[in-house]
């Protein structure tokens, strides 16, 4: 067990051009406060994912009113440290999010309004018990200077706060196999208290209350020898001497995660994904409640009806997230079709359409033929951003402006001869064939295949194709 401590030194304009405007004014006095969110490991999770290691809110800072004409100075800060207690081991690597919030104190209907001024995030390695680490982070035109450390709460010591120390029983030395507790040389490292009944020969523990088995042993207290009979999905390694191991209890067996947390195995142990309102290695620490004011941007906090909903924030229009910390970007609804660019204008959504598309949601494929004429009786055919002309007989080209040779495509079948004509083409059919394209054989008895020759035309006569 221990505490992560964060000390904010300053929050103000960063170096360089483009100094930010002061967040407060004579008409709208305001004050700052900070929120820190910690997650184990070097995760790059979304800002609203659970703060599995814990979270803390600072007190509100002094009220600040901008002096007219003066650039934004470093803003007055809340007193004291932000402290995030952790119940179990300190993970050594962690991710942090530090948010600077502004509380406007004007005549707001329904109380003060909150808005997020800046959010910084990072991933760090930190041993518990070490000195304060200093950091500078920039968010836009703002700069945040802060220090942080992790310290163990007695009797825990060590870089992960997992070793326990007890006062020496004898003035001169510690018990067998136990070292003095640096830096508390007058105390001794206490033996870890494993789970009651854990086999002293075949079991060990790295944290109080657990019982981990040496190879070849299984069971909750490591008292059951591993079977060498056939097994399906060995959890341990197989060897020539032992065959394969029967799956021992996995780190998630029996779900060590409290309060509705879900367990997932990691290479070394397990990890709990905690429901909102809980944190700690096993989700056993009850976190933020409505008393902490967790809902931002005017969100209404309602105490959860059960432990896995310590609180619910009912967000005002335009905000979302577990703490109403995110402005709703309605473009995330993906309203624009056909690759249109979405713009959330606040009062309305707009889609900026790609060429060839139109409509409020870019859902209409534009009539590519609009305003484009096909010459010589051609008709325009729409086609995904480029118009095409289907030309009348005798014409060709992109806009049907070119006179075409209707016989170029050799339209007369069965050796028929083609003649260009002002209204199209004429096929003079070879003996034995008939039809506009000489496509029908003439039967020997003089009857023709369908369709019948029109009256007044003998099979073999030239036929005009109109």
């Amino acid at each position: 067990a221990g505490v992560f401590e964060l000390q904010i030194h300053s929050f103000g304009p960063g170096p360089g051009p483009g100094a930010p405007r002061s967040p407060c004014s004579a008409r709208l006095p305001c004050r700052l406060f900070f929120r820190v969110c910690l997650k184990p490991g070097l995760s790059e999770e979304a800002a609203e994912s659970p703060c599995a290691l814990g979270a803390a809110l600072s007190a509100r800072g002094p009220v600040y009113t901008e002096q007219p004409g003066a650039p934004a100075p470093d803003l007055p800060l809340p007193d004291g440290l932000l402290q995030v207690p952790f119940r179990d081991a300190w993970p050594g690597t962690f991710s942090f999010i530090i948010e600077t919030w502004r509380e406007e104190l004007g005549d707001q209907i329904g109380g003060p309004a909150w808005s997020l001024l800046a959010r910084v995030a990072g991933r760090r390695r930190l041993a518990a018990g070490g000195p304060w680490a200093r950091d500078i982070q920039r968010a836009g035109a703002w700069e945040l200077r802060f220090s942080y450390r992790a310290r163990c709460e007695p009797p825990a010591v060590g870089t992960a706060c997992t070793r326990l120390c007890r006062p020496r029983s004898a003035p001169s030395r510690c018990g067998p196999g136990l070292r003095p507790c640096a830096p508390l040389e007058d105390e001794c490292e206490a033996p870890l208290v494993c789970r009651a009944g854990c086999s002293p020969e075949h079991g060990f523990c790295e944290q109080p209350g657990e019982c981990r088995c040496l190879e070849g042993w299984t069971g909750p207290l490591c008292t059951v020898p591993v079977s060498t009979s056939s097994c399906l999905s060995p959890r341990g390694p197989s060897s020539a001497t032992t065959g394969c191991l029967v799956p021992g209890p996995g780190p998630c067996d029996g779900n060590p995660c409290a309060n509705g947390g879900s367990c997932s195995e990691t290479p070394r142990s397990f990890e709990c994904t905690c429901p909102r309102g809980f944190y700690g290695l096993r989700c056993e620490v009850s976190g933020v409640t409505c008393a902490d004011g967790p809902c931002f941007n005017g969100g209404l906090c309602v105490g959860g009806a059960d432990p896995d909903s310590a609180y619910i924030c009912h967000c005002p229009p335009g905000f979302q997230g577990s703490n109403c910390e995110k402005r709703v970007d309605r473009c995330s609804l993906q309203p624009c079709r056909n690759g249109g660019l979405c713009l959330d204008l606040g009062h309305a959504l707009r889609c900026r359409c790609r060429a060839g598309f139109a409509g409020p949601r870019c859902e209409h494929d534009l009539d590519d033929c609009a305003g484009r004429a096909c010459a010589n009786g051609g008709t325009c055919v729409e086609g995904g951003g480029a118009h095409r002309c289907s030309c009348a007989l005798g014409f060709g080209g992109r806009d049907c402006r070119e006179r075409a040779d209707p016989c170029a495509a050799r339209p007369c079948a069965h050796g028929g001869r083609c003649y260009a004509h002002f209204s199209g083409l004429v096929c003079a059919c070879a003996p034995g064939y008939m039809g506009a394209r000489c496509e029908f054989p003439v039967h020997p008895d003089g009857a023709s295949a369908l369709p019948a020759a029109p009256p007044g035309l003998r099979p073999g006569d030239p036929q005009r194709y109109l």
Epitope: A46, P317, Q320, V328, R330, S332, L333, Q334, P335, C336, R337, A348, C351, P360, R361, E363
Partner: antibody, heavy 117, light 107 residues
Framework: QIQLVQSGPELKKPGETVKISCKAS????????MHWVKQAPGKGLKWMGW????????GYADDFKGRFAFSLETSASTAYLQINNLKNEDTATYFC??????????WGQGTSVTVSS | DIQMTQTTSSLSASLGDRVTISCRAS??????LHWYQQKPDGTVKLLIY???RLHSGVPSRFSGSGSGTDYSLTISNLELEDIATYFC?????????FGGGTKLEIK
Amino acid sequence: QIQLVQSGPELKKPGETVKISCKASGYTFTDYSMHWVKQAPGKGLKWMGWINTETGEPGYADDFKGRFAFSLETSASTAYLQINNLKNEDTATYFCARYDGYAMDYWGQGTSVTVSS
Amino acid sequence: DIQMTQTTSSLSASLGDRVTISCRASQDHSNHLHWYQQKPDGTVKLLIYYTSRLHSGVPSRFSGSGSGTDYSLTISNLELEDIATYFCQQGDMLPWTFGGGTKLEIK
């Protein structure tokens, strides 16, 4: 043709977890957000929220914050709804629906979830 | 949140009748009003979007109208396959909300 096919009915005990799937076909999955709607027995429709299929970012209605999680398996054109620590009041039919920029234009057939001890 | 009210929870009509189902919103929502049909087997289909636009494949006997806070769905010539529950939904402000539904039955 456009289809949303949901996984089969589920019978669960209070405290358990359920994960419902919604497999899309007939269109480009990542072009349209996917929405989830709850219908308790004999009741009306209640919008739960959505997930952006391009970024994976979810948005939840107030009554569905906490125990509910939307997720994606983009390669399989599938959206998921997971409900943790089930309660009796989670007994309902859950629908997935595609949003076309105006309305939810295509719906899954619904997945019935019964929570009973 | 915008509340959607369908005052008539059930409605009986004869085949061939002209049927109108109404829906009222607690505040104006810029015509972002949609109508859905839920058949007795549970399947849900979009009928009308953006107040009056007919979704593809929906028979032309369905039509929608309204503005501001008052909207309606009309079936001009009731057929047996129209037996269903009809829901209105506003899509202007998050969270989206549905009316309680109007169940349409045959006399």
